[in-house]
């Protein structure tokens, strides 16, 4: 006998899709050997219609696929525009058609629906609405009319004009007369039921004159829509449920091992905690119709998801309802990159974000998410030149390394930078990933000046003092714009005195303005990094002021941070304190600013919590 | 959370026929499979039947030790699925359970036990030769 299986039996109807699951030993043989889907014909043969080898015959052309699933030991067979042509035998098998590693399905698509007998059909999706018209004749216009649903043997009432409602339909069933021109009554049930699927019978009058129209209500589960993703890449689900709920609350909920749909995220505000930084539920439109996205996709975020709209936001009876199967690639074409990044307070962070390289020329762009509401995620920089206001001087994108990766750096850091940020590209989608910044406890590596003061047409030295452990690292001094970080060139002091039990491999290296103008003004930064991998930076804002007396100026580190036998050169200067220090013209007071760059489609934003890796902010 | 009891087992001779029936109440449109297992004396429990429903289509298994003999099906408006049993054998003698869940296709193998989350209480079969 085969160790083959699968369904004995499909039964479909015209116009559907079926998805057929073929199960097979997973030995490494079989995981790897030919799978395929034949008819059988009369004389015994069997035709192949598409296998895994990539043939697909004209008559499943466009219409179907084959899915192999060698982890599970199943392939599945997804056809879709079934027709009654396709009735009859099939086998689903491995290697050769005619070796025997196969199972017999019988296929049958019945006729859809149509009139028959006088019977209207109504086909209709659990928890949608359905209106059953119910034509009558003039003499019977003032007279009862009704709506039965045939139990067993026996009409039940279900409603009348005269007020009556079944209570099993209570609260979701109403008759509507239309005006006295149209010869008509309408009944609309809502949040329809699968119990609510059967033969109703709607009637105007009571006597042996009576109009009665027979309709058939046939309540379809949705069937599942198979969505295949990579790991820590991301998904959207797109639900469309209809006008009618457009003002009832909606969900997404994950079929979980109890009987329960366990909520995910709805528009009430609740959302699971495996989904914190990594999730959007998209505003929805007018009609209705919303979408989630779920970015750093897991192995465990695999299973069975639906939307649905219900006032209580999670899924009750009658909740009108769309479903995927969600299967995540574990042979991802994403890389794994660190989902958490370290740095402390007054330091900084480099970011890597991966991004399809096939797609180089895309805009990257890196945003904040929020999790207030359903979440959204405002854009705080793109590589086209635009930072968001409050990050001027401390947030840039490089589009180094190149090649599948993006830098974001960010500096002079304070708690409220901690939080889920996304690294997203304005081409695939898929391609979107998370990184948590966390603020630790410690000091910055780099030491630098507060801000700055330069005189116009003098000379300006600012240092930045490298402790040992960057001693390998390249060591650079940069004027910060809206586009990058525009290399500066800067001079190697020798050994600094600014640190502690650090031997003469610290470095104190000096950017030197000579003859400032007023278009040195700005942010600088000093950095180091390997290659094109950035380590850690360090701000200074540098003001241009009007000639008071003649000289060059010298800036030092503040008296806190000198060592011991270092002459402090310039005591103007406030301290270094163990914060970030910001350009004094943006600190005045954090103000909401309504950005118009802010994602109000948080559709195109998007993360990866996929790997549970770890980066420093000092190293990478 | 949804309850099911099964009913129509019974003593019944070698060649004859019985139909059991796996009634489901509760949060019954949230299940998408049904499956039929059995259970002989001294014997592990073992796959006999599945249904799963999908949008307008139906899929039905069979285990190769009742092809032929034995079908399944449901009345949806009833929340009752169906074991029609013929040409019974006395190694068909055994406890048989309906098992619901509410994951359809794709979902776990239809015959593995771990892919149902709801059980009834059992009901026997006999077979005398």
């Known amino acids: 006998k085969s160790p083959i299986f699968g369904p004995e039996e499909v039964n479909s109807v015209e116009g559907n899709s079926v998805s057929i699951t073929c199960y097979y030993p997973p030995t490494s043989v079989n995981r790897h050997t030919r799978k395929y889907w034949c008819r059988q014909g009369a004389r015994g043969g069997c035709i192949t219609l598409i296998s895994s080898e990539g043939y697909v015959s004209s008559k499943y052309a466009g219409r179907a696929n084959l899915t192999n699933f060698p982890e599970n030991g199943t392939f599945v067979v997804n056809i879709a525009q079934l027709s009654q042509d396709d009735s009859g035998r099939y086998k689903c098998g491995l290697g050769i058609n005619s070796r025997g590693l196969s199972f017999d399905v019988s296929l049958e698509v019945s006729q859809g629906p149509g009139l028959l007998n006088d019977t209207k059909v109504y086909t209709v999706d659990l928890g949608r609405t359905v209106t059953i018209n119910c034509p009558f004749k003039t003499e019977n216009a003032q007279k009862r009319k009704s709506l039965y649903k045939q139990i067993g043997l026996y009409p039940v009432l279900v409603i009348d004009s005269s007020g009556y409602v079944n209570p099993n339909y209570t609260g979701r069933i109403r008759l509507d007369i239309q005006g006295t021109g149209q010869l008509l009554f309408s009944v609309v049930i809502n949040q329809l039921r699968l119990s609510d699927a059967g033969q109703y019978l709607c009637q105007a009058g009571d006597d042996s004159n009576s109009n009665k129209k027979n309709a058939d209500l046939q309540v379809l589960k949705p069937e599942p829509e198979l969505v295949y993703e990579d790991l820590r890449g991301s998904v959207t689900f797109h639900c469309a449920l209809g006008p009618e709920v457009a003002n009832v609350a909606k969900f997404l909920c994950r079929q979980s091992s109890g009987e329960n749909c366990d909520v995910v995220v709805n528009t009430l505000g609740k959302r699971a905690p495996a989904f914190e930084g990594r999730i959007l539920l998209n505003p929805q439109d007018k009609d209705g119709s919303f979408s989630v996205v779920i970015t750093g996709l897991r192995k465990e975020d695999a299973g069975r998801y639906l939307c649905g709209a219900h006032s209580d936001g999670q899924l009750q009876e009658g909740s009108p309802i769309q479903a995927w199967q969600l299967f995540v690639n574990e042979e991802s074409t994403i890389p794994r990159s660190p989902t958490v990044v370290k740095g402390v307070a007054g330091g900084s962070v480099a970011v890597l974000c991966p991004y399809n390289r096939k797609e180089s020329k895309s805009i990257k762009y890196w945003c904040l998410w929020e999790g207030a509401q359903n979440g959204r995620c405002p854009l705080l920089v793109d590589s086209e030149g635009w930072v968001k206001a409050q990050y001027e001087g401390r947030l840039s994108l490089l589009e180094e390394p190149g090649n599948g990766t993006f830098t974001v750096i960010l500096n002079q850091l304070t708690s409220r930078d901690a939080g889920f940020y996304w690294c997203l590209t304005n081409g695939d989608t898929l391609w979107r990933t998370t990184v948590e910044i966390k603020i630790i406890e410690g000091e910055p590596n780099l030491k630098v000046p507060g801000n700055v003061t330069a005189v116009l047409g003098e000379t300006l030295k600012v240092p930045c003092h490298f402790p040992c452990k960057f001693s390998s690292y390249e060591k650079y001094w940069c004027k910060w714009n809206n586009t990058g970080c525009q290399a500066l060139p800067s001079q190697d002091e020798g050994p600094s005195k600014a640190f502690v039990n650090c031997d003469e491999n610290s470095r104190l290296v000096s950017l030197t303005l000579n003859l400032v103008t007023r278009a040195d003004e700005g942010w600088y930064w000093c950095g180091v990094k390997q290659g094109h991998f950035y380590g850690e930076t360090a701000a200074v804002y540098v003001a241009v002021e009007e000639r008071k007396a003649a000289g060059s100026r010298d800036v030092s580190l503040a008296k806190a941070d000198a060592a011991p036998d270092e002459k402090v050169l310039d005591s103007g200067f406030r301290e270094i304190e163990n914060k970030a220090i910001q350009d004094p013209r943006l600190f005045a007071e954090e103000k909401a600013v309504a950005d118009t760059r802010d994602q109000a489609d948080g559709s195109r934003a998007s993360v990866d919590s996929g790997s549970s890796e770890e980066q420093g902010g000092s190293s990478r | 959370q949804v309850q099911l009891v099964e009913s129509g087992g019974g003593l019944v001779q070698t060649g004859g026929s019985l139909r059991l029936s796996c009634a489901a109440s509760?949060?019954?449109?949230?299940?998408?499979?049904v499956g039929w297992f059995r259970q002989a004396p001294g014997k592990e429990r073992e796959f006999v039947a599945a249904v799963i429903w999908s949008g307008a289509s139906t899929y039905k298994y069979a285990a190769d030790s009742v092809k032929g003999r034995f079908t399944i099906s449901r009345d949806n408006a009833e929340n009752t699925v169906y074991l029609q049993m013929n040409s019974l054998k006395p190694e068909d003698t055994a406890v048989y359970y309906c098992a619901a869940d509410p994951l359809g296709l794709p979902g776990p193998d239809v015959r593995v036990e771990g892919g149902y989350r709801h059980w009834g209480q059992g009901t026997l079969v006999t077979v005398s030769s």
């Open positions: 509760g949060r019954t449109f949230s299940v998408y499979r």
